[in-house]
Interface confidence: low
Protein backbone atom coordinates (compact mmCIF):
# COMPACT_ATOMS: atom_id res chain seq x y z
CA UNK A 1 0.00 0.00 0.00
CA UNK A 2 1.34 3.40 -1.00
CA UNK A 3 1.66 6.00 1.81
CA UNK A 4 1.25 9.71 1.15
CA UNK A 5 1.79 12.42 3.78
CA UNK A 6 -0.19 15.64 3.62
CA UNK A 7 -0.23 18.95 5.47
CA UNK A 8 -3.32 20.36 7.13
CA UNK A 9 -4.76 23.15 4.97
CA UNK A 10 -2.78 22.10 1.90
CA UNK A 11 -3.87 20.26 -1.27
CA UNK A 12 -2.86 16.68 -2.03
CA UNK A 13 -3.04 14.74 -5.28
CA UNK A 14 -3.41 10.95 -5.07
CA UNK A 15 -2.50 9.22 -8.32
CA UNK A 16 -4.28 6.36 -10.05
CA UNK A 17 -3.05 5.04 -13.42
CA UNK A 18 -4.66 2.63 -15.86
CA UNK A 19 -2.72 0.49 -18.36
CA UNK A 20 -4.84 1.85 -21.21
CA UNK A 21 -3.87 5.38 -22.19
CA UNK A 22 -7.45 6.52 -22.67
CA UNK A 23 -10.45 7.72 -20.71
CA UNK A 24 -12.19 4.79 -19.09
CA UNK A 25 -14.47 4.42 -16.09
CA UNK A 26 -12.93 4.89 -12.62
CA UNK A 27 -14.09 5.44 -9.05
CA UNK A 28 -12.39 6.68 -5.92
CA UNK A 29 -13.78 5.36 -2.62
CA UNK A 30 -12.78 5.66 1.02
CA UNK A 31 -12.12 2.75 3.41
CA UNK A 32 -15.85 2.58 4.18
CA UNK A 33 -16.52 1.97 0.48
CA UNK A 34 -18.30 5.30 0.15
CA UNK A 35 -17.86 6.75 -3.33
CA UNK A 36 -15.96 10.03 -3.42
CA UNK A 37 -15.85 10.68 -7.13
CA UNK A 38 -15.68 9.02 -10.52
CA UNK A 39 -16.64 9.60 -14.11
CA UNK A 40 -19.51 9.06 -16.44
CA UNK A 41 -18.21 9.51 -19.95
CA UNK A 42 -16.44 12.83 -19.90
CA UNK A 43 -18.33 14.09 -16.85
CA UNK A 44 -17.09 14.14 -13.26
CA UNK A 45 -19.51 12.60 -10.79
CA UNK A 46 -19.33 12.91 -7.01
CA UNK A 47 -20.57 10.59 -4.31
CA UNK A 48 -21.98 11.31 -0.85
CA UNK A 49 -18.67 11.43 1.01
CA UNK A 50 -17.76 14.20 3.44
CA UNK A 51 -15.10 15.29 0.94
CA UNK A 52 -17.74 16.25 -1.62
CA UNK A 53 -16.95 19.96 -1.99
CA UNK A 54 -13.19 19.53 -1.47
CA UNK A 55 -12.62 16.62 -3.89
CA UNK A 56 -11.74 17.04 -7.54
CA UNK A 57 -9.89 15.37 -10.41
CA UNK A 58 -8.04 16.52 -13.53
CA UNK A 59 -10.16 15.77 -16.56
CA UNK A 60 -7.31 16.81 -18.84
CA UNK A 61 -5.36 13.72 -17.69
CA UNK A 62 -8.12 11.14 -18.19
CA UNK A 63 -7.27 10.66 -21.87
CA UNK A 64 -3.77 9.61 -20.81
CA UNK A 65 -5.16 6.98 -18.42
CA UNK A 66 -4.47 9.09 -15.29
CA UNK A 67 -7.34 9.56 -12.81
CA UNK A 68 -6.04 11.57 -9.84
CA UNK A 69 -8.00 12.39 -6.69
CA UNK A 70 -7.33 15.94 -5.56
CA UNK A 71 -8.31 16.84 -1.99
CA UNK A 72 -8.19 20.54 -1.11
CA UNK A 73 -7.90 22.20 2.29
CA UNK A 74 -6.79 19.01 4.00
CA UNK A 75 -8.04 18.14 7.47
CA UNK A 76 -6.53 15.70 9.97
CA UNK A 77 -9.70 13.61 9.71
CA UNK A 78 -9.09 13.16 5.95
CA UNK A 79 -6.42 10.64 6.98
CA UNK A 80 -7.74 7.38 5.54
CA UNK A 81 -7.12 4.66 2.97
CA UNK A 82 -8.40 5.74 -0.44
CA UNK A 83 -9.20 3.13 -3.09
CA UNK A 84 -9.11 3.76 -6.82
CA UNK A 85 -11.13 1.24 -8.88
CA UNK A 86 -10.19 1.13 -12.56
CA UNK A 87 -10.01 -1.75 -15.13
CA UNK A 88 -11.18 -4.25 -12.47
CA UNK A 89 -8.14 -3.29 -10.41
CA UNK A 90 -7.95 -1.62 -7.02
CA UNK A 91 -5.17 0.75 -6.07
CA UNK A 92 -4.91 1.65 -2.38
CA UNK A 93 -3.29 4.82 -1.08
CA UNK A 94 -2.95 5.59 2.61
CA UNK A 95 -3.15 9.33 3.29
CA UNK A 96 -1.84 10.64 6.60
CA UNK A 97 -2.48 14.32 7.29
CA UNK A 98 -0.42 16.22 9.87
CA UNK A 99 -0.65 19.72 11.28
CA UNK A 100 1.96 21.71 13.19
CA UNK A 101 1.01 24.84 15.07
CA UNK A 102 2.51 27.20 17.60
CA UNK A 103 0.40 26.80 20.74
CA UNK A 104 0.31 30.55 21.28
CA UNK A 105 0.77 33.59 19.10
CA UNK A 106 3.74 33.40 16.72
CA UNK A 107 4.81 36.85 18.00
CA UNK A 108 6.56 36.19 21.31
CA UNK A 109 8.50 38.37 23.70
CA UNK A 110 12.19 37.73 24.19
CA UNK A 111 12.63 35.24 27.05
CA UNK A 112 9.24 33.62 26.57
CA UNK A 113 8.73 29.97 25.58
CA UNK A 114 7.66 28.59 22.24
CA UNK A 115 5.68 25.36 22.13
CA UNK A 116 4.99 23.63 18.83
CA UNK A 117 2.20 21.03 18.82
CA UNK A 118 1.85 18.30 16.23
CA UNK A 119 -1.64 17.19 15.22
CA UNK A 120 -1.57 13.68 13.85
CA UNK A 121 -4.07 10.98 12.84
CA UNK A 122 -4.90 8.18 15.29
CA UNK A 123 -2.58 5.21 15.03
CA UNK A 124 0.35 7.19 13.61
CA UNK A 125 3.66 7.47 15.46
CA UNK A 126 5.53 10.32 13.85
CA UNK A 127 8.79 11.89 14.96
CA UNK A 128 9.42 15.62 14.62
CA UNK A 129 12.62 17.56 14.23
CA UNK A 130 12.73 21.36 14.07
CA UNK A 131 15.58 23.62 13.08
CA UNK A 132 15.60 27.20 14.35
CA UNK A 133 16.81 30.13 12.19
CA UNK A 134 20.13 30.08 14.07
CA UNK A 135 20.62 26.38 13.26
CA UNK A 136 19.65 24.87 16.60
CA UNK A 137 17.96 21.44 16.27
CA UNK A 138 15.25 20.18 18.60
CA UNK A 139 13.50 16.83 18.47
CA UNK A 140 10.32 15.55 20.01
CA UNK A 141 7.04 13.74 19.64
CA UNK A 142 3.65 15.43 19.84
CA UNK A 143 5.05 18.63 21.36
CA UNK A 144 8.33 20.51 21.16
CA UNK A 145 9.25 23.28 23.56
CA UNK A 146 11.91 25.96 23.42
CA UNK A 147 12.32 28.04 26.53
CA UNK A 148 13.97 31.45 26.79
CA UNK A 149 13.59 32.57 23.19
CA UNK A 150 16.37 34.82 21.97
CA UNK A 151 16.45 37.46 19.28
CA UNK A 152 18.25 35.05 16.91
CA UNK A 153 15.25 32.71 17.13
CA UNK A 154 13.25 35.16 14.99
CA UNK A 155 12.59 33.89 11.51
CA UNK A 156 11.44 30.72 9.80
CA UNK A 157 11.50 27.50 11.78
CA UNK A 158 11.67 24.41 9.55
CA UNK A 159 10.10 21.30 11.03
CA UNK A 160 10.23 17.84 9.46
CA UNK A 161 7.65 15.19 10.36
CA UNK A 162 8.79 11.61 9.68
CA UNK A 163 6.32 8.72 9.33
CA UNK A 164 6.72 5.38 7.46
CA UNK A 165 10.05 6.56 5.97
CA UNK A 166 8.19 9.46 4.40
CA UNK A 167 8.56 13.05 5.45
CA UNK A 168 6.61 16.29 5.28
CA UNK A 169 8.07 19.71 5.97
CA UNK A 170 6.42 22.60 7.82
CA UNK A 171 7.63 26.18 7.92
CA UNK A 172 6.53 28.42 10.79
CA UNK A 173 7.43 32.09 10.97
CA UNK A 174 8.25 33.15 14.52
CA UNK A 175 8.76 36.78 15.46
CA UNK A 176 10.69 37.42 18.67
CA UNK A 177 9.65 40.82 19.97
CA UNK A 178 12.73 42.56 21.32
CA UNK A 179 14.89 45.64 21.05
CA UNK A 180 17.86 45.31 18.71
CA UNK A 181 20.24 45.81 21.62
CA UNK A 182 19.78 44.67 25.20
CA UNK A 183 22.02 47.47 26.40
CA UNK A 184 23.76 50.55 25.05
CA UNK A 185 26.07 53.20 26.40
CA UNK A 186 26.36 56.85 25.34
CA UNK A 187 29.46 58.91 26.11
CA UNK A 188 29.06 62.71 26.08
CA UNK A 189 30.91 65.85 27.10
CA UNK A 190 29.06 68.10 29.51
CA UNK A 191 26.61 70.33 27.67
CA UNK A 192 26.32 68.21 24.53
CA UNK A 193 22.95 67.06 23.26
CA UNK A 194 22.27 63.38 23.94
CA UNK A 195 20.41 61.10 21.52
CA UNK A 196 19.05 57.78 22.79
CA UNK A 197 17.71 55.39 20.20
CA UNK A 198 15.75 52.22 20.91
CA UNK A 199 15.35 50.40 17.58
CA UNK A 200 13.08 47.37 17.59
CA UNK A 201 14.30 44.12 16.09
CA UNK A 202 11.01 43.36 14.39
CA UNK A 203 8.45 44.94 12.11
CA UNK A 204 4.74 44.41 12.36
CA UNK A 205 1.84 46.06 10.54
CA UNK A 206 0.31 47.64 13.62
CA UNK A 207 2.13 48.22 16.87
CA UNK A 208 0.27 49.47 19.91
CA UNK A 209 1.32 49.70 23.53
CA UNK A 210 2.81 51.97 26.15
CA UNK A 211 6.26 52.58 27.52
CA UNK A 212 8.28 54.31 30.18
CA UNK A 213 11.89 55.30 30.77
CA UNK A 214 13.03 54.96 34.37
CA UNK A 215 16.33 56.63 35.19
CA UNK A 216 18.74 55.94 38.02
CA UNK A 217 21.15 58.86 38.18
CA UNK A 218 24.49 58.02 39.74
CA UNK A 219 24.11 60.92 42.16
CA UNK A 220 20.49 60.10 43.11
CA UNK A 221 19.37 57.77 45.86
CA UNK A 222 16.38 56.44 43.92
CA UNK A 223 15.26 56.01 40.32
CA UNK A 224 12.82 58.37 38.65
CA UNK A 225 10.40 58.07 35.74
CA UNK A 226 11.68 60.45 33.06
CA UNK A 227 8.99 59.92 30.44
CA UNK A 228 5.89 57.84 29.74
CA UNK A 229 4.42 57.43 26.28
CA UNK A 230 1.84 55.63 24.20
CA UNK A 231 2.38 53.83 20.94
CA UNK A 232 -0.58 53.57 18.59
CA UNK A 233 -0.15 52.09 15.12
CA UNK A 234 3.55 53.00 15.26
CA UNK A 235 2.80 56.64 16.22
CA UNK A 236 4.35 57.79 19.50
CA UNK A 237 2.60 60.26 21.78
CA UNK A 238 4.10 61.50 25.03
CA UNK A 239 1.85 61.16 28.08
CA UNK A 240 4.05 62.60 30.78
CA UNK A 241 7.59 63.98 30.89
CA UNK A 242 9.63 65.32 33.80
CA UNK A 243 10.46 69.01 33.87
CA UNK A 244 14.10 68.26 34.62
CA UNK A 245 15.37 66.97 32.31
CA UNK A 246 12.83 67.89 29.64
CA UNK A 247 13.20 65.06 27.16
CA UNK A 248 11.93 65.24 23.59
CA UNK A 249 10.60 62.09 22.00
CA UNK A 250 10.37 61.19 18.33
CA UNK A 251 6.82 60.65 17.16
CA UNK A 252 7.71 57.77 14.85
CA UNK A 253 9.55 54.49 15.24
CA UNK A 254 12.34 53.81 16.05
CA UNK A 255 11.78 55.12 19.57
CA UNK A 256 14.06 58.11 19.87
CA UNK A 257 14.73 60.36 22.85
CA UNK A 258 16.70 63.59 22.97
CA UNK A 259 18.17 65.01 26.16
CA UNK A 260 18.88 68.73 25.54
CA UNK A 261 22.22 68.56 27.31
CA UNK A 262 24.44 66.09 29.12
CA UNK A 263 24.98 67.16 32.72
CA UNK A 264 26.72 65.31 35.57
CA UNK A 265 23.44 65.02 37.48
CA UNK A 266 21.92 63.05 34.57
CA UNK A 267 24.75 60.53 34.28
CA UNK A 268 23.56 57.05 35.15
CA UNK A 269 21.51 54.15 33.84
CA UNK A 270 18.05 53.97 32.40
CA UNK A 271 15.64 51.18 31.66
CA UNK A 272 13.17 51.65 28.83
CA UNK A 273 10.21 49.27 29.08
CA UNK A 274 7.63 48.73 26.39
CA UNK A 275 4.37 46.89 27.08
CA UNK A 276 2.69 45.75 23.88
CA UNK A 277 -1.05 45.38 23.50
CA UNK A 278 -2.33 41.79 23.95
CA UNK A 279 1.06 40.58 25.19
CA UNK A 280 2.00 39.58 28.70
CA UNK A 281 5.38 40.84 29.79
CA UNK A 282 7.46 43.79 28.62
CA UNK A 283 10.37 44.53 26.33
CA UNK A 284 13.39 46.05 28.05
CA UNK A 285 16.44 47.98 26.93
CA UNK A 286 19.06 49.35 29.25
CA UNK A 287 20.74 52.62 28.34
CA UNK A 288 23.71 54.20 30.10
CA UNK A 289 24.98 57.76 30.02
CA UNK A 290 28.57 58.74 30.85
CA UNK A 291 29.30 62.47 31.13
CA UNK A 292 32.75 64.10 31.08
CA UNK A 293 33.75 67.50 32.44
CA UNK A 294 37.15 69.20 32.23
CA UNK A 295 37.67 72.26 34.44
CA UNK A 296 40.45 74.51 35.67
CA UNK A 297 40.14 76.07 39.09
CA UNK A 298 43.02 78.22 40.19
CA UNK A 299 46.11 76.00 39.82
CA UNK A 300 44.24 72.72 39.45
CA UNK A 301 43.22 71.19 36.10
CA UNK A 302 40.64 68.47 36.71
CA UNK A 303 38.94 65.93 34.48
CA UNK A 304 35.97 63.96 35.82
CA UNK A 305 33.54 61.41 34.47
CA UNK A 306 30.18 60.43 35.92
CA UNK A 307 28.08 57.44 35.11
CA UNK A 308 28.51 53.68 34.76
CA UNK A 309 32.10 53.23 33.61
CA UNK A 310 33.84 49.87 33.67
CA UNK A 311 36.84 49.53 36.02
CA UNK A 312 39.15 48.89 33.05
CA UNK A 313 38.50 52.31 31.50
CA UNK A 314 41.40 54.73 31.66
CA UNK A 315 41.04 58.46 32.32
CA UNK A 316 43.98 60.60 31.17
CA UNK A 317 45.05 64.23 31.06
CA UNK A 318 47.62 65.17 28.47
CA UNK A 319 48.97 68.25 26.81
CA UNK A 320 48.31 68.12 23.07
CA UNK A 321 50.93 66.10 21.14
CA UNK A 322 52.64 65.05 24.38
CA UNK A 323 52.62 61.99 26.61
CA UNK A 324 49.85 61.69 29.17
CA UNK A 325 50.70 63.63 32.31
CA UNK A 326 48.37 61.49 34.38
CA UNK A 327 46.52 58.27 33.53
CA UNK A 328 44.41 56.36 36.04
CA UNK A 329 41.64 53.79 36.23
CA UNK A 330 39.62 56.30 38.21
CA UNK A 331 36.72 58.66 37.64
CA UNK A 332 38.71 61.83 38.32
CA UNK A 333 42.26 62.89 37.47
CA UNK A 334 43.99 66.22 37.91
CA UNK A 335 47.21 68.10 37.26
CA UNK A 336 48.50 70.81 39.58
CA UNK A 337 50.03 73.90 38.04
CA UNK A 338 49.39 72.82 34.43
CA UNK A 339 51.53 74.46 31.80
CA UNK A 340 49.84 76.65 29.18
CA UNK A 341 48.46 74.98 26.07
CA UNK A 342 45.60 72.80 24.85
CA UNK A 343 44.98 69.97 27.30
CA UNK A 344 43.04 66.85 26.41
CA UNK A 345 41.03 64.76 28.80
CA UNK A 346 40.58 61.25 27.37
CA UNK A 347 38.43 58.34 28.48
CA UNK A 348 39.70 55.22 26.75
CA UNK A 349 39.25 51.49 26.66
CA UNK A 350 42.32 49.45 25.67
CA UNK A 351 43.71 52.42 23.77
CA UNK A 352 40.46 53.24 21.99
CA UNK A 353 39.22 56.74 22.86
CA UNK A 354 35.57 56.75 23.91
CA UNK A 355 35.29 60.37 24.97
CA UNK A 356 37.48 63.43 24.66
CA UNK A 357 37.23 66.95 26.07
CA UNK A 358 39.65 69.76 25.36
CA UNK A 359 40.44 72.66 27.64
CA UNK A 360 42.80 75.52 26.90
CA UNK A 361 45.06 76.55 29.75
CA UNK A 362 46.25 80.12 29.36
CA UNK A 363 49.32 81.62 30.98
CA UNK A 364 48.75 82.13 34.71
CA UNK A 365 47.49 85.72 34.47
CA UNK A 366 44.54 84.67 32.20
CA UNK A 367 41.40 82.60 32.77
CA UNK A 368 40.90 79.26 31.01
CA UNK A 369 38.99 78.96 27.74
CA UNK A 370 36.81 75.95 26.99
CA UNK A 371 36.43 75.42 23.23
Amino acid sequence: KKVVLGKKGDTVELTCTASQKKSIQFHWKNSNQIKILGNQGSFLTKGPSKLNDRADSRRSLWDQGNFPLIIKNLKIEDSDTYICEVEDQKEEVQLLVFGLTANSDTHLLQGQSLTLTLESPPGSSPSVQCRSPRGKNIQGGKTLSVSQLELQDSGTWTCTVLQNQKKVEFKIDIVVLAFQKASSIVYKKEGEQVEFSFPLAFTVEKLTGSGELWWQAERASSSKSWITFDLKNKEVSVKRVTQDPKLQMGKKLPLHLTLPQALPQYAGSGNLTLALEAKTGKLHQEVNLVVMRATQLQKNLTCEVWGPTSPKLMLSLKLENKEAKVSKREKAVWVLNPEAGMWQCLLSDSGQVLLESNIKVLPTWSTPVQP
Partner: antibody, heavy 118, light 108 residues
Framework: EVQLVESGGGLVQPGGSLRLSCAAS????????MHWVRQATGKGLEWVST???????YYPGSVKGRFTISRENAKNSLYLQMNGLRAGDTAVYYC????????????WGQGTTVTVSS | EIVLTQSPGTLSLSPGERATLSCRAS???????LAWYQQKPGQAPRLLIY???SRATGIPDRFSGSGSGTDFTLTISRLEPEDFAVYYC?????????FGPGTKVDIK
Amino acid sequence: EVQLVESGGGLVQPGGSLRLSCAASGFTFSSYDMHWVRQATGKGLEWVSTIGTAGDTYYPGSVKGRFTISRENAKNSLYLQMNGLRAGDTAVYYCARGNYFYYGVDVWGQGTTVTVSS
Amino acid sequence: EIVLTQSPGTLSLSPGERATLSCRASQSVSSSYLAWYQQKPGQAPRLLIYGASSRATGIPDRFSGSGSGTDFTLTISRLEPEDFAVYYCQQYGISPFTFGPGTKVDIK
Protein backbone atom coordinates in the same frame (compact mmCIF):
# COMPACT_ATOMS: atom_id res chain seq x y z
CA GLU B 1 21.01 73.24 4.18
CA VAL B 2 17.42 72.00 4.60
CA GLN B 3 15.36 73.35 1.70
CA LEU B 4 11.96 72.93 0.04
CA VAL B 5 11.33 74.38 -3.42
CA GLU B 6 7.82 74.37 -4.93
CA SER B 7 7.02 74.53 -8.65
CA GLY B 8 4.10 73.95 -11.00
CA GLY B 9 1.87 76.89 -10.08
CA GLY B 10 0.17 79.03 -12.69
CA LEU B 11 -3.07 80.24 -14.21
CA VAL B 12 -5.75 77.63 -14.87
CA GLN B 13 -9.44 77.78 -15.84
CA PRO B 14 -12.17 76.59 -13.46
CA GLY B 15 -12.56 72.82 -13.73
CA GLY B 16 -8.98 72.46 -14.92
CA SER B 17 -6.07 70.54 -13.42
CA LEU B 18 -2.60 71.38 -12.14
CA ARG B 19 0.21 69.36 -10.58
CA LEU B 20 2.43 71.00 -8.00
CA SER B 21 5.87 69.61 -7.18
CA CYS B 22 8.15 70.16 -4.21
CA ALA B 23 11.86 69.30 -4.33
CA ALA B 24 13.35 68.56 -0.91
CA SER B 25 17.05 68.65 -0.05
CA GLY B 26 19.31 68.62 3.00
CA PHE B 27 17.43 65.95 4.99
CA THR B 28 16.29 62.32 4.81
CA PHE B 29 13.05 62.96 2.97
CA SER B 30 11.56 59.48 3.49
CA SER B 31 11.63 59.87 7.31
CA TYR B 32 9.33 62.89 7.47
CA ASP B 33 5.61 63.65 7.18
CA MET B 34 5.08 66.19 4.41
CA HIS B 35 2.30 68.77 4.02
CA TRP B 36 0.72 71.19 1.60
CA VAL B 37 -0.67 74.38 3.16
CA ARG B 38 -2.26 77.22 1.22
CA GLN B 39 -2.95 80.90 1.79
CA ALA B 40 -5.28 83.08 -0.24
CA THR B 41 -4.23 86.72 -0.59
CA GLY B 42 -4.89 88.58 2.67
CA LYS B 43 -6.28 85.44 4.33
CA GLY B 44 -5.05 82.94 6.89
CA LEU B 45 -3.29 79.59 6.51
CA GLU B 46 -5.36 76.62 5.36
CA TRP B 47 -4.12 73.05 5.64
CA VAL B 48 -4.56 71.21 2.34
CA SER B 49 -3.04 67.76 2.69
CA THR B 50 -0.56 65.56 4.56
CA ILE B 51 1.26 62.39 3.56
CA GLY B 52 2.89 60.24 6.23
CA THR B 53 6.08 58.22 5.96
CA ALA B 54 4.08 55.07 5.23
CA GLY B 55 2.21 56.79 2.39
CA ASP B 56 -0.89 57.41 4.54
CA THR B 57 -2.78 60.48 3.28
CA TYR B 58 -5.02 63.09 4.94
CA TYR B 59 -7.27 65.79 3.43
CA PRO B 60 -9.82 68.34 4.67
CA GLY B 61 -13.37 68.06 3.27
CA SER B 62 -12.85 71.08 1.01
CA VAL B 63 -10.36 69.24 -1.26
CA LYS B 64 -11.15 65.58 -0.63
CA GLY B 65 -11.80 63.73 -3.88
CA ARG B 66 -10.30 66.55 -5.97
CA PHE B 67 -6.71 66.75 -4.70
CA THR B 68 -4.22 63.88 -4.39
CA ILE B 69 -0.97 64.11 -2.44
CA SER B 70 1.85 61.72 -3.27
CA ARG B 71 5.56 61.33 -2.65
CA GLU B 72 8.50 59.82 -4.48
CA ASN B 73 11.14 59.14 -1.85
CA ALA B 74 13.78 58.08 -4.39
CA LYS B 75 13.54 61.54 -5.96
CA ASN B 76 13.06 63.47 -2.69
CA SER B 77 9.87 64.85 -4.19
CA LEU B 78 6.37 65.69 -2.99
CA TYR B 79 3.44 66.25 -5.35
CA LEU B 80 -0.07 67.65 -5.26
CA GLN B 81 -2.37 66.71 -8.13
CA MET B 82 -5.26 69.20 -8.23
CA ASN B 83 -8.31 68.37 -10.33
CA GLY B 84 -11.68 70.13 -10.66
CA LEU B 85 -10.14 73.44 -9.65
CA ARG B 86 -12.39 76.24 -8.41
CA ALA B 87 -11.93 79.98 -7.94
CA GLY B 88 -11.75 79.34 -4.18
CA ASP B 89 -8.58 77.28 -4.70
CA THR B 90 -6.68 80.41 -5.77
CA ALA B 91 -3.81 80.82 -3.27
CA VAL B 92 -0.10 80.52 -2.58
CA TYR B 93 0.61 76.82 -1.97
CA TYR B 94 3.36 76.02 0.50
CA CYS B 95 5.16 72.70 0.74
CA ALA B 96 6.16 72.01 4.36
CA ARG B 97 7.89 69.39 6.49
CA GLY B 98 6.51 67.89 9.69
CA ASN B 99 9.21 67.60 12.35
CA TYR B 100 10.51 64.10 13.13
CA PHE B 101 10.60 64.57 16.90
CA TYR B 102 7.36 66.39 17.57
CA TYR B 103 4.12 67.60 16.04
CA GLY B 104 4.83 70.82 14.25
CA VAL B 105 5.68 72.05 10.74
CA ASP B 106 9.28 73.14 11.03
CA VAL B 107 10.44 73.78 7.44
CA TRP B 108 8.48 75.69 4.80
CA GLY B 109 9.07 76.40 1.12
CA GLN B 110 8.62 79.90 -0.29
CA GLY B 111 5.37 78.91 -2.02
CA THR B 112 4.03 78.70 -5.57
CA THR B 113 1.00 80.70 -6.76
CA VAL B 114 -2.08 79.01 -8.23
CA THR B 115 -4.69 81.23 -9.89
CA VAL B 116 -8.01 79.74 -10.98
CA SER B 117 -9.85 82.16 -13.27
CA SER B 118 -11.67 82.22 -16.58
CA GLU C 1 -13.48 68.88 12.83
CA ILE C 2 -11.64 70.80 15.55
CA VAL C 3 -12.24 74.53 15.09
CA LEU C 4 -9.56 76.86 16.50
CA THR C 5 -10.59 80.40 17.47
CA GLN C 6 -7.91 83.04 18.04
CA SER C 7 -8.36 86.24 19.98
CA PRO C 8 -8.00 89.11 19.71
CA GLY C 9 -8.10 89.44 15.92
CA THR C 10 -5.67 92.38 16.15
CA LEU C 11 -3.44 93.42 19.03
CA SER C 12 -1.97 96.94 18.91
CA LEU C 13 1.04 97.31 21.20
CA SER C 14 4.31 99.19 21.51
CA PRO C 15 7.80 97.68 21.49
CA GLY C 16 8.78 96.53 24.99
CA GLU C 17 5.20 95.67 25.93
CA ARG C 18 3.91 92.18 26.74
CA ALA C 19 1.67 90.41 24.19
CA THR C 20 -0.79 87.67 25.18
CA LEU C 21 -2.46 85.76 22.35
CA SER C 22 -5.22 83.21 22.90
CA CYS C 23 -6.14 80.08 20.94
CA ARG C 24 -9.31 78.21 21.89
CA ALA C 25 -10.24 74.76 20.51
CA SER C 26 -13.82 73.55 19.95
CA GLN C 27 -12.85 70.26 21.62
CA SER C 28 -9.97 69.09 23.77
CA VAL C 29 -6.57 68.89 22.04
CA SER C 30 -3.61 67.01 23.49
CA SER C 31 -0.95 69.61 24.24
CA SER C 32 1.56 67.46 22.27
CA TYR C 33 -0.34 68.43 19.15
CA LEU C 34 -0.58 72.22 19.47
CA ALA C 35 1.83 74.51 17.61
CA TRP C 36 2.22 78.28 17.09
CA TYR C 37 3.61 79.96 13.95
CA GLN C 38 4.70 83.48 13.09
CA GLN C 39 4.25 84.94 9.60
CA LYS C 40 5.56 88.22 8.27
CA PRO C 41 4.29 89.83 5.03
CA GLY C 42 5.64 88.14 1.90
CA GLN C 43 7.28 85.36 3.90
CA ALA C 44 6.50 81.72 4.67
CA PRO C 45 5.36 80.94 8.22
CA ARG C 46 7.92 80.05 10.90
CA LEU C 47 7.43 77.52 13.68
CA LEU C 48 7.71 79.15 17.13
CA ILE C 49 6.23 76.71 19.64
CA TYR C 50 5.41 73.00 19.48
CA GLY C 51 3.82 70.75 22.08
CA ALA C 52 1.99 73.85 23.38
CA SER C 53 5.00 75.04 25.39
CA SER C 54 8.32 73.98 23.80
CA ARG C 55 10.28 76.56 21.82
CA ALA C 56 11.47 75.48 18.37
CA THR C 57 15.18 75.71 17.54
CA GLY C 58 16.50 79.26 17.38
CA ILE C 59 13.39 80.90 18.87
CA PRO C 60 14.23 83.57 21.49
CA ASP C 61 13.12 82.91 25.07
CA ARG C 62 10.81 85.94 25.08
CA PHE C 63 8.35 83.63 23.28
CA SER C 64 6.55 81.17 25.52
CA GLY C 65 3.53 78.90 25.18
CA SER C 66 1.19 77.47 27.77
CA GLY C 67 -2.20 75.84 28.17
CA SER C 68 -3.94 72.51 27.87
CA GLY C 69 -7.28 71.01 26.89
CA THR C 70 -9.13 73.69 24.94
CA ASP C 71 -7.30 76.88 26.01
CA PHE C 72 -3.79 77.76 24.84
CA THR C 73 -1.77 80.97 25.10
CA LEU C 74 1.25 82.41 23.31
CA THR C 75 3.07 85.09 25.30
CA ILE C 76 5.74 87.49 24.02
CA SER C 77 7.26 88.93 27.19
CA ARG C 78 8.81 92.07 25.63
CA LEU C 79 7.92 92.93 22.06
CA GLU C 80 10.85 93.61 19.75
CA PRO C 81 10.36 95.49 16.45
CA GLU C 82 10.78 92.21 14.50
CA ASP C 83 7.93 90.55 16.45
CA PHE C 84 5.17 92.55 14.73
CA ALA C 85 3.55 89.92 12.52
CA VAL C 86 0.58 87.53 12.28
CA TYR C 87 0.51 84.56 14.66
CA TYR C 88 -1.35 81.31 13.95
CA CYS C 89 -2.06 78.32 16.16
CA GLN C 90 -2.48 74.84 14.65
CA GLN C 91 -3.65 71.52 15.97
CA TYR C 92 -1.80 68.56 14.46
CA GLY C 93 -3.53 65.76 16.32
CA ILE C 94 -6.82 64.98 14.62
CA SER C 95 -7.34 65.27 10.87
CA PRO C 96 -8.20 67.79 9.47
CA PHE C 97 -5.13 69.50 10.94
CA THR C 98 -6.72 72.92 11.35
CA PHE C 99 -5.15 76.36 11.76
CA GLY C 100 -6.66 79.22 13.71
CA PRO C 101 -7.61 82.40 11.78
CA GLY C 102 -4.60 84.27 13.14
CA THR C 103 -3.91 87.23 15.43
CA LYS C 104 -2.20 90.29 13.95
CA VAL C 105 0.21 92.04 16.31
CA ASP C 106 0.80 95.55 15.02
CA ILE C 107 2.60 98.66 16.25
CA LYS C 108 0.49 101.09 18.23
